[in-house]
Interface confidence: low
């Protein structure tokens, strides 16, 4: 039985040109995390594999940095980065857990939500 739950940063916003940390946390399970995938809609952004470490998709290498932890840092944000992001935890023996984050990239100088996840 899958007992775990994914906690995420939820709905967050950030300024155009800035950076943001996407964070998910898997709790309430003793399952072994074997891999975490980060996806944007249907595109794979990055993989963190327990044996092989991080792999960033070539098309995102300039703007995506691994970490902190199993999170993902998006840099040089554009309005086109607005949308849904998914952290997909592959675990044994539980199976797959998925968390959803909605990021809104704002033109204005004030990003109201998720400020505590901002990077200077």
């Amino acid at each position: 039985m899958m007992t775990g739950t994914i906690e995420t940063t939820g709905n967050i916003s950030a300024e155009k040109g800035g950076s943001i940390i996407l964070q998910c946390h898997l709790s309430s399970t003793t399952a072994q995390v074997t891999q975490v995938n980060w996806e944007q809609q249907d595109q794979l952004l990055a993989i963190c594999n327990a044996d092989l470490g991080w792999h960033i998709s070539p098309s995102f290498k300039d703007r995506v940095a691994p970490g902190p932890g199993l999170g993902l840092t998006l840099q040089s944000l554009t309005v086109n980065d607005t949308g849904e992001y998914f952290c997909i935890y592959h675990t044994y023996p539980d199976g797959t857990y998925t968390g959803r984050i909605f990021l809104e990239v704002l033109e204005s100088s004030v990003a109201e939500h998720g400020a505590r996840f901002q990077i200077p």
């Epitope: 072994q32 995390v33 074997t34 975490v36 963190c48 327990a50 044996d51 092989l52 470490g53 991080w54 792999h55 290498k61 940095a65 691994p66 970490g67 932890g69 199993l70 044994y92």
Partner: antibody, heavy 119, light 107 residues
């Protein structure tokens, strides 16, 4: 405290095989990767490969594919590395090293096993 | 494979001096870098991971810095026990590779 216990020096003949053990204690064996690292002649360090004791998944440096085989015995918390078709080039110190998941840096090391290949 | 280039290969310094060892990665490894110290005839010991995080028990005179492709390990006020060899290693993704090492000797 964390300990990785390796055997003493090994002297083997060219063409033979050797299996080096690494007995882990002081932590949960399946919670960390186990890596093997080669150091020739006091020179730099070369990563050979890694095995996940929980799943048995292994991964090798291309250079050591076919040369090294990594296995684990969960019941005894022991990792093994077998080296085959030995030549003088394989003479070196071999370390086992505990690797942290999601960032394979090596936070605990065995004391090393000196392998000498000579007829 | 990512190539790690370490410099200098050897370094002579006196107790009390400050030294800096550098490490360059052939491609962007973000902050996925570790530093190790190795004494003659002993196994390496982890000093720093994630480029700047000191391992528990490592004296604060050691500090790591850098990101991307350029990294350094600084040792303030050298102590007799600091002499030995130092290696950098990237932990960005397999295969994990080490720098060629820096031998730190007493002047």
């Amino acid at each position: 405290q964390v300990q990785l216990q390796q055997p003493g020096p090994e002297l083997v003949k060219p063409g033979a095989s050797v299996k080096i053990s690494c007995k882990a204690s002081g932590y949960s064996f399946t919670d960390y990767n186990m890596n093997w690292v080669k150091q020739s002649n006091g020179k730099s360090l070369e990563w050979i490969g890694v095995i996940n004791p929980n799943s048995g998944t292994d991964n090798y440096n291309q250079k050591f594919k076919g040369k090294a085989t990594l296995t684990v015995d969960q019941s005894s918390s022991t990792a093994y590395m077998q080296l085959n078709s030995l030549t003088s080039e394989d003479s070196a110190v071999y370390f086992c090293a505990r690797g942290v998941y999601f960032g394979n840096y090596f936070d605990s090391w065995g004391q090393g096993t000196t392998l000498t290949v000579s007829s | 494979d990512i190539v790690m280039t370490q410099s200098p290969a050897s370094l002579s310094a006196s107790v009390g001096e400050t030294v800096t060892i550098t490490c360059r990665a052939s491609e962007n490894i973000y902050s996925s870098l570790a530093w190790y110290q190795q004494k003659q005839g002993k196994s390496p010991q982890l000093l720093v991971f994630n480029a700047k995080t000191l391992t528990e028990g490592v004296p604060s005179r050691f500090s790591g810095s850098g990101s991307g492709t350029q990294f350094s390990l600084k040792i303030n006020s050298l102590q007799p026990e600091d002499f030995g060899s130092y290696y950098c290693q990237h932990h960005y993704g397999a295969p994990w590779t080490f720098g060629g090492g820096t031998k730190l000797e007493i002047k």
